[in-house]
């Protein structure tokens, strides 16, 4: 259970413990959400494929002043091998589609849960 197989990404694949912590944080965000997350801020949708961690960070880093996702941003930066700054975009962004942060987190959570299961059972 040290790492997740079957998932190509630039840079290291997060160990299952780190991935588990990220999922737990996203679960906390979705469960504790009362008002619209990050005041309903919109972010670029991403392809949930290789390089997803950097793409997710590139999308979320453009949301400022939202304490609810600051821990997620820090965790994602640990999974991304290069430095990401606001305004940066990779080919993984679906540049014509913006979604609310809450939906982005929900989609990311579902995908990471799937990756976690794959890592556990393969």
């Amino acid at each position: 259970l040290t790492c997740l197989g079957g998932f190509a990404s630039p840079g290291p694949v997060p160990p299952s413990t780190a991935l588990r912590e990220l999922i737990e944080e996203l679960v906390n965000i979705t469960q504790n959400q009362k008002a619209p997350l990050c005041n309903g801020s919109m972010v670029w949708s991403i392809n949930l494929t290789a390089g997803m961690y950097c793409a997710a960070l590139e999308s979320l880093i453009n949301v400022s002043g939202c304490s609810a996702i600051e821990k997620t941003q820090r965790m994602l930066s640990g999974f991304c091998p290069h430095k990401v700054s606001a305004g940066q975009f990779s080919s993984l962004h679906v540049r014509d589609t913006k979604i609310e942060v809450a939906q982005f987190v929900k989609d990311l959570l579902l995908h990471l849960k799937k990756l976690f299961r794959e890592g556990q059972f393969n």
Partner: antibody, heavy 120, light 107 residues
């Protein structure tokens, strides 16, 4: 409402193979892992193994020394547990269990159990 | 494999009593622990997950606590329907392992 319905009781001879089914409803089958648990008469619970229904990837308890095969049929939302080379010590109730690892835990929901009796 | 040592193996108590059951893991299980209640002839029922989170629909008299290797299930005031056998389970790593069980009997 999440439901897990297991196949009926079985009587088998030593050396035979038993295959138990667990049909699920009330959630998307591929969203949760599925596990199998053994409980011998008057004894505690023992994890046998589990499966990710999405990929078919499995994990199992070495105690069963490769005698356990766990499969999942996505087309019928049914998981299966096959136990081969049966011996008298395999007489037990077998349960399937499932759940969201991060929201309720992987054993949040249980089947009703299937009694397998191994006798010559 | 991670060993789960549950104690006591049995206890006698009266309705209204506070009951505490403990589980000790042979290594840190990161709070990936569940508690179950089982009555004779029935499937186990999930009570607590992630060491301290109450499963929906479970009465608030049940609570879980602990971290690292040591975990506790507490029933604050025993109800007649609480007489049963209780099991802990670690799901931090494979193979998942259960405690030996604690039978709660009527005094």
């Amino acid at each position: 409402e999440v439901q897990l319905v297991q196949s009926g009781a079985e009587v088998k001879k030593p050396g035979a193979t038993v295959k138990i089914s667990c049909k699920v409803s009330g959630y998307t089958f591929t969203d949760y892992e599925m596990h199998w648990v053994q409980q011998a008469p008057g004894k505690g619970l023992e994890w046998m193994g589990g499966i990710d229904p999405e990929t078919g990837g499995t994990a199992s308890n070495q105690k069963f020394k490769g005698r356990v095969t766990i499969t999942a049929d996505k087309s019928t939302d049914t998981a299966y547990m096959e136990l081969s080379s049966l011996r008298s010590e395999d007489t037990a109730v077998y349960y399937c269990a499932t759940g969201d690892y991060f929201g309720g835990g992987p054993f949040a929901y249980w089947g009703q159990g299937t009694l397998v009796t191994v006798s010559s | 494999d991670i060993q789960m040592t549950q104690s006591p193996s049995s206890l006698s108590a009266s309705v209204g009593d506070r009951v505490t059951i403990t589980c000790k893991a042979s290594q840190d299980i990161n709070s990936y622990l569940s508690w179950f209640q089982q009555k004779p002839g029935k499937a186990p029922k999930s009570l607590i997950y992630r060491a301290n989170r109450l499963v929906d629909g479970v009465p608030s008299r049940f609570s879980g606590s602990g971290s690292g290797q040591d975990y506790t299930l507490t029933i604050s005031s025993l109800d007649p329907e609480d007489f049963a056998t209780y099991y802990c389970l670690q799901y931090d790593e494979f193979p998942y392992t259960f405690g030996g069980g604690t039978k709660v009997e009527i005094k």
